[in-house]
């Protein structure tokens, strides 16, 4: 069943390549379980990025190797992306799922466009 | 492919406890909720125990509350079903079922069961 | 005695089409949780035939339907065949049981 998820249209990137963003979604149901997954579209192609299961009023908790890090507050998710750069550029689409008890909801976000500037190397400087 | 295969099913006397495992593969474990469903020999489904795919969230039926404790490990892909306590009536075909199509929560696989008997 | 109501038996000839129906409550069906139905053939493990009250999952066909209002629910066979011979449930998660419920199953025989 769907269910509507909302993030912002745009986000830059600071100059560490960390973009952080909001995931919201207007749950129908009373989740306890819901997962969250972050989606890059670039090129007509979507790639995964990251997913965490969280228990509500819990931390999301992402695999010890993912770019991402989160944390969440009723029914908005705080998504913060990591060590982007500005081959990353692209558009980030929040895919959320209740997934326990029943029923069993999904949406799927507009999508995030995140624009990654690599910063300019510092000159060389004669001491 | 999706597959579950319960295990540890057996003939055990009244009082007695029995431990089910049902392994999965093929699909992300972790990511969906788990259920025990049984069936008494000639008799109807009945839905025993579930639990959520992080294993935070655990519902018993009325029928085995206190006697009966649902568990994953999410490393090994594997549900459990610990069994205390059995009775006669506890006697039946355990099935482990979940839903991993990422569309629905209705049981879309079924592992082949496993039979436990309660006899002296 | 199961939550959800079905009738014991059913039975048609070939080509017919069948109804069973399946009787909830305000806790269940009428509280807006989809049905589901699943057939099991003899000595198998169930299959799922109809989730969401009224979708069929790949492979199924569309000689089956089912629909839901208020508390109730029915499955609808048509074009009755041999191999539907089966034990028929629904089931649909329950809020005041926190739980999943099924009903008893209905016995559906093909005649002839």
């Known amino acids: 069943k769907a269910m509507h998820v909302a993030q912002p249209a745009v986000v830059l990137a600071n100059s560490r390549g960390t973009a952080s963003f909001v995931c919201e979604y207007a749950s129908p149901g009373k989740a306890t379980e819901v997962r969250v997954t972050v989606l890059r579209q670039a090129d007509s192609q979507v790639t995964e990025v990251c997913a965490a299961t969280y228990m509500m009023g819990n931390e999301l908790t992402f695999l010890d190797d993912s770019i991402c890090t989160g944390t969440s507050s009723g029914n908005q998710v705080n998504l913060t992306i990591q060590g982007l750069r500005a081959m990353d550029t692209g558009l980030y689409i929040c895919k959320v799922e209740l997934m326990y008890p029943p029923p069993y909801y999904m949406g799927i976000g507009n999508g995030t466009q995140i624009y990654v500037i690599d910063p300019e190397p510092c000159p060389d400087s004669d001491f | 492919e999706v597959q579950l295969l319960e295990s540890g099913g057996g003939l055990v006397q009244p009082g007695g406890s029995l431990r089910l495992s049902c392994a999965a593969s093929?699909?992300?474990?972790?990511?969906?909720?788990m259920s025990w469903v049984r069936q008494a020999p000639g008799k109807g489904l009945e839905w025993v125990s579930g639990?959520?795919?992080?294993?935070?969230?655990?519902h018993y039926a009325d029928s085995v509350k206190g006697r009966f404790t649902i568990s994953r490990d999410n490393s090994k892909n594997t549900l459990y079903l610990q069994m205390n306590s059995l009775r006669a009536e506890d006697t039946a075909v355990y099935y482990c079922?979940?839903?991993?199509?990422?569309?629905?929560?209705?049981?879309?696989?079924w592992g082949q069961g496993t039979l436990v008997t309660v006899s002296s | 005695q199961s939550v959800l109501t079905q009738p014991p038996s059913a039975s048609g000839t070939p080509g017919q089409r069948v109804t069973i129906s399946c009787t909830g409550s305000?806790?269940?069906?009428?509280?807006?949780?989809?049905v589901h139905w699943y057939q099991q053939l003899p000595g198998t493990a169930p299959k799922l035939l109809i989730y969401?009250?009224?979708k069929r999952p790949s492979g199924v066909p569309d000689r089956f339907s089912g629909s839901k209002s208020g508390t109730s629910a029915s499955l609808a066979i048509s074009g009755l065949r041999s191999e539907d011979e089966a034990d028929y449930y629904c089931?649909?998660?329950?809020?005041?049981?926190?739980?999943?419920?099924f009903g008893g199953g209905t016995k559906l025989t093909v005649l002839g």
């Open positions: 089931a649909a998660w329950d809020d005041s049981l926190n739980g999943w419920v």
């Open positions: 969401d009250n009224n």
């Open positions: 305000s806790s269940n069906i009428g509280a807006g949780y989809d």
């Open positions: 639990i959520s795919g992080s294993g935070g969230y655990i």
């Open positions: 093929g699909f992300t474990f972790s990511s969906y909720a």
């Open positions: 079922a979940t839903y991993s199509s990422g569309l629905h929560d209705a049981f879309d696989i």
